[in-house]
Interface confidence: low
């Protein structure tokens, strides 16, 4: 069982290495933002036993403007690189970041991993707050090793919350 792509979090990105059940991944606050104390960037692929559908737990992460970087212009909303270019993780700046999650992985690759179609765009998003098949859980202290590791990195773009149909410049979502 695999999870679909995780929801996006305002001012944060996530690069999913494994979509397998019990995989644990971390969101990274965008440049110019840092993790608010007391919030967690962790999300885990879990199974809703009532529906037998896997989904990502909702992270408590809040990315706030980094006061140390107020003199800099905030980075524009993230977008996926265009056709033929595989998104790669950026080097992480130390401010306000949690340590990266360690994900032991096996050699069994690609069977259940997801990948973005080259040339496709990710839309700005708002995190659903509640849902029929969504269950929230506290971070467990025990980490289950990821069963599958993605060869291709996936970048989930996020942007500031906008009213439906209104998007930051550079995005198009006509209906």
């Amino acid at each position: 069982i695999t999870c679909p792509p995780p929801m996006s979090v305002e001012h944060a990105d996530i690069w999913v290495k494994s979509y397998s059940l019990y995989s644990r991944e971390r969101y990274i606050c965008n440049s110019g933002f840092k993790r608010k104390a007391g919030t967690s960037s962790l999300t885990e692929c879990v199974l809703n036993k009532a529906t037998n559908v896997a989904h990502w737990t909702t992270p408590s992460l809040k990315c706030i403007r980094d006061p140390a970087l107020v003199h800099q212009r905030p980075a524009p909303p993230s977008t996926v690189t265009t056709a033929g270019v595989t998104p790669q993780p950026e080097s992480l700046s130390p401010s306000g970041k949690e340590p990266a999650a360690s994900s032991p992985s096996s050699n069994n690759t690609a069977a259940t991993t997801a990948a973005i179609v080259p040339g496709s765009q990710l839309m700005p998003s708002k995190s659903p707050s509640t849902g029929t098949t969504e269950i929230s859980s506290h971070e467990s202290s025990h980490g289950t090793p990821s069963q599958t590791t993605a060869k291709n990195w996936e970048l989930t773009a996020s942007a500031s919350h906008q009213p439906p149909g209104v998007y930051p410049q550079g995005h198009s979502d006509t209906t």
Epitope: P4, P5, P6, M7, S8, T51, V53, H55, W56, I116, V117, S120, Q121, L122, M123, P124, S125, K126, S127, P128, T130, G131, T132, T133, E134, T156, Q162, P164, G165, S172, D173, T174, T175
Partner: nanobody, 124 residues
């Protein structure tokens, strides 16, 4: 409430192709991220492919990448899954799914509407 009805399933030989369709009725279809899941006999329901509200963003699980193509026609309130080079392991009931609360065109985060499913059987 969005109602979803799948069609297009059937029996096909390995290497063959099928086109599944999902007809949606209800509000704001064009803003709902949608996707296809499948459930093989005795197994859980797995994510297959997802598409953003606009249709620009598409994502696939690795085992179908290059063989399956998800698309949607918002004018017709329809979503499709074109499947080629089918394999016996693709045999499953295929479900159309929607995230109707998330109306800004992003990926499925929480599925709250399901179709009844359509059976796809690939014989060797």
């Amino acid at each position: 409430e969005v109602q979803l009805v799948e069609s297009g399933g059937g029996l096909v030989q390995a290497g063959g192709s099928l086109r599944l369709a999902c007809a949606a009725s209800g509000r704001t279809f064009s803003k709902n991220p949608m996707g296809w899941f499948r459930q093989a006999p005795g197994k859980g329901r797995d994510f297959v492919a997802g598409i953003s509200g606009s249709g620009f963003g598409k994502v696939y699980t690795g085992s179908v990448k290059g063989r399956f193509t998800i698309s949607r026609d918002n004018a017709k309130n329809a979503m499709y899954l074109d499947m080629i080079s089918l394999k016996p392991e693709d045999t499953a009931v295929y479900y159309c799914a929607a995230d109707t609360r998330n109306r800004d065109g992003t990926w499925i985060g929480v599925v709250d509407s399901w179709g009844q499913g359509t059976q796809v059987t690939v014989s060797s």
